[in-house]
């Protein structure tokens, strides 16, 4: 069967059930429903999934049976619209049910909430988890899929199946171990951190497709796959890009069964043709399906072919540049991007896309000029400042990170970003700045050749988090501008923002800076978040505060928490010393 070129099926639901198997079918339908109806109880979703599964089985038995010819959107949408409490729980989302497909599905997609009002997931005691796992393994694993999917409505569904497989393996192994906690907790921490990263990366892919269109996503994919598979022909990269775009379009559009099926086909194709694609795929291709797809997605860059010719000859020096460009603009620009990217694994994808955009803009202008060749002859010189800007920024920030360490580096970024966009909510500023600060430990350890792709492409993912959170409740024109003008220039746009001089400082509220003994029982991470929340609030009260002033106040604050957490009567200490700290801080900052 050729990849994605399927025979017409009488029953789409039967076709997907047979392709995916019952276990994956049920898991994917559960993910789809939880990503759409994020507030519904687990039991309600399980009931809906079981009903859909039973229906699918009737269609497998007889594809001509009643309703089996309906589209998956129609079947799933009809099922979601049977939820009795839709209006009370979701408000205007219930209006989607009055629409016909495809408008109804688009309506559901628009109501996905990147920051749903759900309680933080609290991890129970290890023995409690192991008992639950042994009592009903299937329900335990479904609950995992449900809880992740409803909190991450754009999580890459086939990849979530891979996470669930690892989650199951961790419990299977560790619940039999002598020291269950020592075995299990690090594995769960790793899955949580990897899961958050995977969710954020996929969120950027969906934002790229939904906000900037297929062409933007394809350009990103050409650049990334050309870096990863530099020995592959342009047509091979183009074919992979087309197929990958289809997979992600489906997943971002809620078509999770098609997405998972097509992703499996793509992995199969890549492994069958690995000799033409990359020498690094051998190990990946020996793994089972879910591991194989994950491994391919993360595979290291292949070695660059030796003796690649200079790009200048055909893209700058040739008199035929405008003729070649005019013949098929996107193919020519795609070849430029492919050729540039395979020679530059040391560049970030967003930098490569900026270079390609500069090249395109130059050709658009010059190919209409009196002397095109003279006009575009110096186009590569325009690349130099574009390359140096991220290089210098990364160098400066890695030096700062090495000097300060992660926590204080995060604090420096908190101050920097709060001054740039003080209107943004404090929890968002804390979350985004903490993640921006993680770029240090993630990327600064790498040699020069790997720093930029690591750092700038990671920053693109984190800034997209800011963009999607801000889009839900827009409060800053500057954030909207940086988020919407250009996908590849988001990071330079935010970097270029200076202190917002139009901002009216927030009124001082002593309650914001009142702390209690409960801070003493928090984990180190939670305590940091409390302190960083206070720091953001300080900057919002006093945006013109100097680094030195803020450092002094934060040092006093850290000493105050340490002192009161050692006190016999902690609550009294927090009340009395807290008042003194607030007064001293106001004086120090001139509030």
């Amino acid at each position: 069967r050729g990849v994605f070129r399927r025979d017409a099926h009488k029953s789409e639901v039967a076709h997907r059930f047979k392709d995916l198997g019952e276990e994956n079918f049920k898991a994917l339908v559960l993910i789809a429903f939880a990503q759409y109806l994020q507030q519904c109880p687990f039991e309600d979703h399980v009931k809906l999934v079981n009903e859909v599964t039973e229906f699918a089985k009737t269609c497998v038995a007889d594809e001509s049976a009643e309703n089996c010819d309906k589209s998956l959107h129609t079947l799933f949408g009809d099922k979601l619209c049977t939820v009795a409490t839709l209006r009370e729980t979701y408000g205007e989302m219930a209006d989607c049910c009055a629409k016909q497909e495809p408008e109804r599905n688009e309506c559901f997609l628009q109501h996905k909430d990147d920051n749903p009002n759900l309680p933080r997931l609290v991890r129970p005691e290890v023995d409690v988890m192991c008992t639950a796992f042994h009592d009903n393994e299937e329900t335990f694993l479904k609950k995992y899929l449900y809880e992740i999917a409803r909190r991450h409505p754009y999580f890459y569904a086939p990849e979530l199946l891979f996470f669930a497989k690892r989650y199951k393996a961790a419990f299977t192994e560790c619940c039999q171990a002598a020291d269950k906690a020592a075995c299990l907790l690090p594995k769960l921490d790793e899955l949580r951190d990897e899961g958050k990263a995977s969710s954020a990366k996929q969120r950027l892919k969906c934002a790229s497709l939904q906000k900037f269109g297929e062409r933007a996503f394809k350009a990103w994919a050409v650049a990334r796959l050309s870096q990863r598979f530099p020995k592959a022909e342009f047509a091979e990269v183009s074919k992979l890009v087309t197929d990958l775009t289809k997979v992600h379009t489906e997943c971002c559009h809620g078509d999770l069964l098609e997405c998972a099926d097509d992703r499996a086909d793509l992995a199969k194709y890549i492994c069958e043709n690995q000799d033409s694609i990359s020498s690094k795929l051998k190990e990946c291709c020996e793994k089972p399906l879910l591991e194989k797809s994950h491994c391919i997605a993360e595979v290291e860059n292949d070695e660059m072919p030796a003796d690649l010719p200079s790009l200048a000859a055909d893209f700058v020096e040739s008199k035929d540049v405008c003729k070649n460009y005019a013949e098929a603009k996107d193919v020519f620009l795609g070849m430029f991007l492919y050729e540039y990217a395979r020679r530059h694994p040391d560049y970030s994808v967003v930098l490569l896309l900026r270079l390609a955009k500069t090249y395109e803009t130059t050709l658009e202008k010059c190919c209409a000029a009196a002397d095109p060749h003279e006009c575009y002859a110096k186009v590569f010189d325009e690349f130099k400042p574009l390359v140096e800007e991220p290089q210098n920024l990364i160098k400066q920030n890695c030096e700062l990170f090495e000097q300060l360490g992660e926590y204080k580096f995060q604090n420096a970024l908190l101050v920097r970003y709060t001054k740039k966009v003080p209107q943004v909510s404090t929890p968002t500023l804390v979350e985004v700045s903490r993640n921006l600060g993680k770029v240090g430990s993630k990327c600064c350890k790498h040699p020069e050749a790997k720093r930029m792709p690591c750092a700038e492409d990671y920053l693109s993912v984190v800034l997209n988090q800011l963009c999607v959170l801000h889009e839900k409740t827009p409060v800053s024109d500057r954030v909207t501008k940086c988020c919407t003008e250009s996908l590849v220039n988001r990071r330079p746009c935010f970097s270029a923002l200076e202190v917002d001089e139009t901002y009216v400082p927030k009124e001082f509220n002593a309650e914001t800076f009142t702390f209690h003994a409960d801070i003493c029982t928090l984990s180190e991470k939670e305590r940091q978040i409390k302190k960083q929340t206070a720091l953001v609030e300080l900057v919002k009260h006093k945006p013109k505060a100097t680094k030195e002033q803020l450092k002094a106040v934060m040092d006093d604050f850290a000493a105050f928490v340490e002192k009161c957490c050692k006190a016999d009567d902690k609550e009294t200490c927090f009340a009395e010393e807290g008042k003194k700290l607030v007064a001293a801080s106001q004086a120090a900052l001139g509030l």
């Epitope: 022909e233 342009f234 055909d314 193919v331």
Partner: nanobody, 125 residues
Framework: EVQLLESGGGLVQPGGSLRLSCAAS????????MGWFRQAPGKEREGVSS????????FYTNSVKGRFTISRDNAKNTLYLQMNSLRAEDTAVYYC??????????????????WGQGTLVTVSS
Amino acid sequence: EVQLLESGGGLVQPGGSLRLSCAASGNTYLTSCMGWFRQAPGKEREGVSSIYTVGGSTFYTNSVKGRFTISRDNAKNTLYLQMNSLRAEDTAVYYCAAGSPARCRLRDPTTFDYWGQGTLVTVSS
């Protein structure tokens, strides 16, 4: 339309060299991906080497890497294949082919749109 005309085939001893040429005429953009294929008696047509006339990137099948070199002269609209250290198993009819760079894949002859008539290369002592 595009016409492709190969030349340079012949009889050569094992270890010897030959240089094949392929002259292209017509819409040259349609030939911006060019390649050499070969077909030995009773065997399937297989890709030998390809080149993009924009960018200049080259690709070779494993069995000829280090022995064959593909090149092009854009001004003359001519494609070349320099074949050194020839072996008996290189005996075949060699075809020049052309197509769009967005489609042409060396392992798949069907992705090339235009073909020459072929030139015979015989490696024998």
